[in-house]
């Protein structure tokens, strides 16, 4: 054999009941003492340190704290140190070191030592991870190490958890033994925090000691505060606010078009949006997320405003006879009212719709103008103006005429047009052709769609000529004789001599 | 140099008490084991025991337990023997010897006995 | 116990010879742990305390002459006094202490 000793690391009983602490040494065989001797010692193994002596096989004495208190059940002779402490109290806790003592010199205190623990708790062993929905196993854990009093393990606050069971005394790796009872459950969520006791109690003693475990169990999120969907006036301040219930607390993202816009490990997250603009409005999205699961919640902001300045699409120039078509849009919520004007009088209007189709089939002159296309809704009104223009072929109105004033003929020829034409005056019986161009001749004036050319023939009043009025533009030519107003009803009269 | 230096001699009557002392000079005595050696006349030597002179442990021979008691008083360097109920056979000369001993350590381990004190005879007669 | 035994119990040589003694334990004085035998030799001269002679079996003390020797291991020791001188004269033990301390029973030397 060599020196050593076995004995538990550590070994815990219950302040107040007792512990047997398993011991065998061993030494060289060619010691052969006649009478093995042992002393046991209290938290140093150095005799030098005067640690406390525990129990001492040569003679009685022992320390104060120990008298009576300490008694050997091994047998020295069979290198067996088995060692009981009873009545223990709290500063009994701590390292005891076997020695023995062969005689001669042979006296040796072995390294390895028991560390005593003194409890006044049961031992609740929950797994590192308890999860809802998945059936877990907590045990109620004490020490049995006291031959003269043994514990009985009960469950507290185990309502609705099932029914324990006793597995009764277990032996440990290194020679202690424990009273172990278990109870198997299947945990949800609203068991988290749960508190689950379990008492141990010795017969007939009034010793009794209780010990409480706080359930932590894991749960995924599920989002239970959301706003339902948010309408808010632009320039407004907006906030949104996402509350999941999760264990541990999730990962919340606040997120927009697969975008995150903010994200916190909180149980609450508002997402706040000042000054609001209608980019902003759309469907948000609240992620929540742990270890164990996610879940996730929409929110549809509407963002509220004015119309926008309408916009129009569409022809602008048309040709007399052609169906014109105009697309008139905005933006705007909630969508407006879109009405279009000519001259105050509407032409066509739609109700909540963001745009408005105006057709024209066979469009006349008397289409061509300014037209007002106006978006409304409860947050106001925005127009935009636009033009048609019509093209079509002269008309040379009937209030074109000739007239003679003293010694001068004027004639007069309103065309309506559109492109503007070319104005030319025909005197057919002096075989001369006027063009607008000669401007000692023509005086031409363009109001909106009507040209008015005025020719002036000085001298000519006495025998005023035919005019014929000649209007050209790329869709076609009129021609009219001028009348002359007034050549019935002419006076002469002349006066002196 | 190292000096054991015991009382004198004894002469007690059966049933009285003795205490015989070893006094060490020469090195630090604490740090050496005190033997006890009895040798009757014309027999050979006989280990009573020894005593830690660090922590005041005695540890005595299986035959010398009971009326033996060894016991030290550092301040003076000096151990002691003290035999009670003197009987006849306890007539002998009692030696102390040191011993170096590693007892800074938790165990001990023997060293041989080097210095010896020059004895003190103790003779029980009526 | 461990039990030492000495041969002879007495022993007479010529000065200048050499002296032998014999020492057996009844159980191995090796010890294991260190592989050393736990064994010492003592001379006593009459009146006076025993001498240290030799210790660890053949571990001579400072001081003493190197005519003393001593050889042998586990059970079976000799001390060996390679040529006799005059004040050799004495009782010499042997000496176990590895278990409860023993003496053999000596044996005297003397001068032929």
């Known amino acids: 054999g060599h020196w050593g000793a076995w004995m538990p690391s550590s070994i815990s009983a219950f302040e107040g009941t007792c512990v047997s602490i398993p011991c065998r040494f061993d030494f060289p065989d060619e010691l052969r003492p006649a009478v093995v001797h042992g002393v046991w010692y209290f938290n140093s193994p150095y005799p030098k340190n005067y640690p406390p002596v525990v129990f001492k096989s040569r003679t009685q004495v022992v320390h104060e704290s120990f008298q009576g208190r300490s008694r050997l059940l091994g047998d020295l002779g069979l290198r067996n140190c088995t060692l009981l402490l009873s009545t223990l109290s709290p500063e009994l806790g701590g390292k005891y070191y076997f020695r023995g003592d062969l005689g001669g010199y042979n006296q040796y205190t072995f390294s390895e030592h028991s560390v005593l623990d003194i409890i006044n708790t049961p031992n609740i062993v929950v797994p590192p991870e308890v999860v809802a929905g998945t059936e877990v196993e907590v045990s109620c854990m004490v020490p049995d190490n006291c031959p003269e009093l043994r514990p009985e393990l009960s469950w507290l606050g185990h309502e609705g958890l099932g029914e324990p069971t006793v597995l009764g005394r277990l032996r440990e790796d290194e020679g202690t033994w424990v009273q172990v009872s278990l109870l198997h459950f299947v945990p949800t969520r609203e068991a988290n925090g749960h508190r689950l006791g379990c008492q141990a109690a010795f017969p007939n003693t009034t010793l009794q000691f209780e010990g409480y475990a706080s359930l932590d169990v894991k749960y995924p999120p599920v989002i239970v505060e959301m706003n339902s969907s948010v309408e808010a006036i632009e320039g407004s301040h907006v906030s949104l606010l996402c509350g999941a219930d999760s264990n541990p607390p999730p990962l919340l993202t606040w997120m927009r078009d697969g975008m995150v816009l903010r994200e916190a490990v909180a149980e609450s997250l508002y997402l706040d949006l000042e000054e609001v603009t209608p980019a902003e409005d759309g469907i948000y999205a609240c992620l929540a997320e742990n270890a164990y699961g996610q879940d996730n919640r929409t929110v549809e902001l509407s963002v509220m405003y004015a119309p926008w300045k309408p916009t129009v699409n569409g022809t602008v120039v048309a040709v007399e006879g052609e169906t014109v078509s105009i697309l008139c849009s905005t933006q705007s919520n909630p969508d407006p009212i879109l009405t279009i004007f000519k001259e105050k009088q509407i032409l066509a209007t739609v109700i909540y719709e963001s745009q408005l189709q105006l057709e024209l089939p066979a469009v006349t002159p008397e289409d061509d103008g300014e037209y007002w296309c106006v978006a409304e809704n409860q947050y106001g009104q925005r127009a935009t103006a636009f033009n048609l223009s019509v093209e079509f072929a002269p008309i040379i109105l009937l209030e074109s005429h000739c007239a003679a004033a003293r010694d001068t003929v004027q004639c007069l020829c309103v065309v309506k047009s559109n492109p503007e034409p070319s104005v030319a005056f025909e005197l057919p019986s002096r075989n001369v052709t006027v063009n607008e161009t000669e401007r000692e001749f023509v005086y031409s004036e363009r109001s909106g769609l009507l040209l008015t050319s005025i020719l002036t023939l000085r001298g000519q009043a006495q025998a005023p000529p035919r005019v014929i009025c000649t209007s050209r533009n790329l869709y076609g030519t009129q021609s009219l004789e001028l009348p002359f107003q007034g050549a019935h009803r002419l006076m002469w009269a002349k006066i002196g001599p | 140099q190292v000096q054991l230096v015991q009382s004198g001699s004894e002469l007690k009557k059966p049933g009285a008490s003795v205490k015989v002392s070893c006094k060490a000079s020469g090195y630090t005595f604490t740090n050496y084991g005190m033997n006890w050696v009895r040798q009757a006349p014309g027999q050979g030597l006989e280990w009573m025991g020894w005593?830690?002179?660090?922590?005041?442990?005695?540890t005595y021979a299986d035959d010398f337990t009971g009326r033996f008691v060894f016991s030290l008083d550092t301040s003076v360097s000096t151990a002691y023997l003290q035999i009670s109920s003197l009987k006849a056979e306890d007539t002998a000369t009692y030696f102390c010897?040191?011993?170096?001993?590693?007892?800074?350590?938790?165990?001990?381990?023997?060293?041989?006995?080097?210095?010896w004190g020059q004895g003190t005879l103790v003779t029980v007669s009526s | 116990d461990i039990v030492m035994t000495q041969s002879p119990d007495s022993l007479a040589v010529s000065l200048g010879e050499r002296a032998t003694i014999n020492c057996k334990s009844s159980?191995?004085?090796?010890?294991?742990?260190?592989?050393?035998?736990?064994l010492a030799w003592y001379q006593q001269k009459p009146g006076q305390p025993p001498k240290l002679l030799i210790y660890w079996a053949s571990t001579r003390e400072s001081g003493v002459p190197d005519r003393f020797s001593g050889s042998g291991s586990g059970t079976d020791f000799t001390l060996t006094i390679s040529s006799l001188h005059t004040e050799d004269v004495a009782v010499y033990y042997c000496?176990?202490?590895?278990?409860?301390?023993?003496f053999g029973q000596g044996t005297k030397l003397e001068i032929k």
């Open positions: 005593i830690n002179t660090y922590t005041g442990e005695p």
């Open positions: 159980h191995s004085v090796l010890y294991s742990s260190n592989q050393k035998n736990y």
């Open positions: 010897a040191r011993n170096p001993i590693n007892y800074y350590g938790i165990n001990y381990e023997g060293y041989v006995m080097d210095y």
């Open positions: 000496h176990q202490y590895l278990s409860s301390l023993t």
